[in-house]
């Protein structure tokens, strides 16, 4: 009598994650009597995948009716494949007994699973930084197979070169992850800038996946301060202006001090945006010159985005303002711009 053959015709099968995989197996003879079982892997640690007689295998179905008389086709279909299903599958014939005895195994079919990378997620620095400083952005994508993948970084369409990328794990795995860090030098014009992480993989139909981050989340543009005096009004009041320009984000508190004493505090809100994404704000203070005998030291103090205050001081010369209308004397600016780059 001819020896029983267990035929697995495909050495390897490749499927996309989420699809079904068909693993073919036929036997050359109906004898000896005994069941067929499917295993993943070989040796003592092998995993039972399908056993017609017993067990619950919700994702595995026989391709043909195994209860049919003279059935010699023991192919199976595994639904909703994931990268974790990758491996070599063996169709094994047993001889009926107590217990059943393994008789012959097929040559095995290697199941390879191709899986798309997840949408890249880009995260920026935890705290804002100012122009000329370097900040790091991180991009992560997971769950892809095979391991080969390309990742590129762009800032406003220009590819970045200060990049470090790792694909894990280094060895063979059912799926892989990529993590990349890009270092970006900020400029004052970067409020509207964007960084893009672009991931290309064999499973993607030509178009890379993209993750983005706005530099507006990472940048702080400190304000410029300028204090000026308008000409004296008829009622002996001097209008002093504090112009706070080119700052970002909008979170800003301005305090006027007269001779060191708090006169008024204001919070910036609902400001119109400049073309470059920064904001300007102007605050006025009316000083009644006739109420002062000596010169008045006015200080415009700005706290921007939780940073140490920036001061600009200005002296209104009372002696330069006779108690009648008409003087147009420009006040002397005795203050210095104490704004730091931090």
């Amino acid at each position: 009598e001819e020896e029983l053959q267990v035929i697995q015709p495909e050495k390897s099968v490749s499927v996309a994650a989420g699809d079904s995989a068909t693993l073919n197996c036929t036997v050359s003879s109906l004898i000896p009597v005994g069941p067929i079982q499917w295993f993943r892997g070989a040796g003592p640690g092998r995993e039972l995948i399908y056993n017609l007689k017993e067990g619950h295998f919700p994702r595995v179905t026989p391709v043909s009716d195994p209860t049919k008389r003279n059935n010699m086709d023991f192919s199976i279909r595994i639904s909703n494949i994931t990268p974790a299903d990758a491996g070599t599958y063996y169709c094994v014939k047993f001889r009926k007994g107590s217990p059943d005895v393994e008789l012959k195994s097929g040559a095995g079919t290697e199941l390879s699973v191709r899986a798309k990378p997840s949408a890249p997620v880009v995260s920026g620095p935890a705290v804002r930084a100012t122009a000329e400083h370097t900040v790091s952005f991180t991009c992560e994508s997971h769950g892809f197979s095979p391991r080969d993948i390309t990742l590129k970084w762009f800032k406003n369409g220009n590819e970045l070169s200060d990049v470090q990328t790792n694909v894990d794990p280094a060895g063979k795995s059912v799926s892989y992850s990529i993590r990349s860090t890009a270092r970006v030098v900020l400029t004052r014009r970067d409020v509207h800038s964007q960084v893009i992480c672009e991931v290309a993989h064999v499973t993607l139909q030509g178009d890379p996946l993209r993750g983005t981050a706005n530099l507006s989340e990472a940048i702080r543009v400190p304000p410029f301060l300028e204090v000026t005096q308008q000409s004296m009004r008829a009622d002996n009041q001097v209008n002093v202006t504090c112009q706070v320009t080119k700052f970002y984000p909008q979170r800003l508190q301005l305090t006027w001090l007269e001779n060191g004493n708090v006169s008024r505090t204001e919070m910036a809100s609902a400001l119109p945006e400049n073309k470059d994404g920064t904001y300007n704000w102007t605050s006025w203070l009316l000083v009644n010159v006739s109420a002062h005998r000596d010169d008045v030291k006015l200080t415009c103090q700005v706290e921007h985005d939780g940073q140490p205050a920036v001061n600009k001081s200005f002296s209104v010369k009372v002696s330069a303002h006779p108690k009648e209308q008409g003087s147009n004397t420009a006040a002397e600016n005795t203050g210095t711009n104490e704004r730091n780059i931090y």
Partner: antibody, heavy 116, light 109 residues
């Protein structure tokens, strides 16, 4: 699933010509499509692909000689200024469902002859 | 660009023969290699993808192997309908470009 090329004919050098690839049985918005050519008695040559979203990518030698575009059911290859060296059978093909590294469905081809 | 060198450029064989065609890439393409069969006046037909995976409907006498730079297409027992030209095609995952070998013509001895 079927691909059919059309538009191939005898054309004079320098006269632009557009070839079309009409698809049926699947959506062009789901697959990368490619154009290839084969000069008489020669091997296969890759021209370019168009991604599922409509972005074209070209072989390095193309240098603006061809333009690939698509509508919902057709993919076009415009030969901007053909020369006699562009005489060939032009094939369109679709990448496999598992990835963009192979082409599993091909059209029968359309012959372009560039001659004065 | 990657160059694909296919050998031999032609071979003569008889029905039943075992035929081996090789393809070498100028740099590593991992397993991104496909094999096609083309008959005169016809479009190419996919046989093997990812270096070793048999495309559905292709007879099991065709097999592929290799990775990196060296690849092989084997026809275990040549049949009359197998006389044709065979091409290898690479895909490079970094440049995302395709290159074909120059072809191997399998003729009747």
């Amino acid at each position: 699933v079927q691909l059919v090329e059309s538009g191939g004919r005898l054309v004079q050098p320098g006269t632009p010509l557009t070839l079309s690839c009409t698809v049926s049985g699947f959506s062009l918005s789901s697959y990368v499509m490619g154009w290839f050519r084969q000069a008489p008695g020669k091997g296969l040559e890759y021209i370019g692909i168009i991604s599922s979203s409509g972005s074209p990518y070209y072989a390095s030698w193309v240098n603006g000689r061809f333009t690939i575009s698509k509508t919902s059911t057709t993919m076009d290859l415009k030969m901007n200024s053909p020369t006699t060296e562009d005489t060939a059978t032009y094939f369109c093909a679709r990448v496999g469902p598992l990835g963009v590294d192979y082409f599993n469905i091909w059209g029968p081809g359309t012959l372009v002859t560039v001659s004065s | 660009d990657i160059q694909m060198t296919q050998s031999p450029s032609s071979l003569s064989a008889s029905v039943g023969d075992r035929v081996t065609i090789t393809c070498r890439a100028s740099q590593s393409i991992n397993s991104y290699l496909a094999w096609y069969q083309q008959k005169p006046g016809k479009a190419p037909k996919l046989l093997i993808y990812s270096a070793s995976f048999l495309y559905s409907g292709v007879p099991s006498r065709f097999s592929g192997s290799g990775s990196g730079t060296d690849f092989t297409l084997t026809i275990s027992s040549l049949q009359p309908e197998d006389f044709a030209t065979y091409y290898c095609q690479s895909w490079h995952y970094i440049s995302r470009s395709y290159t074909f070998g120059q072809g191997t013509k399998v003729e009747i001895k």
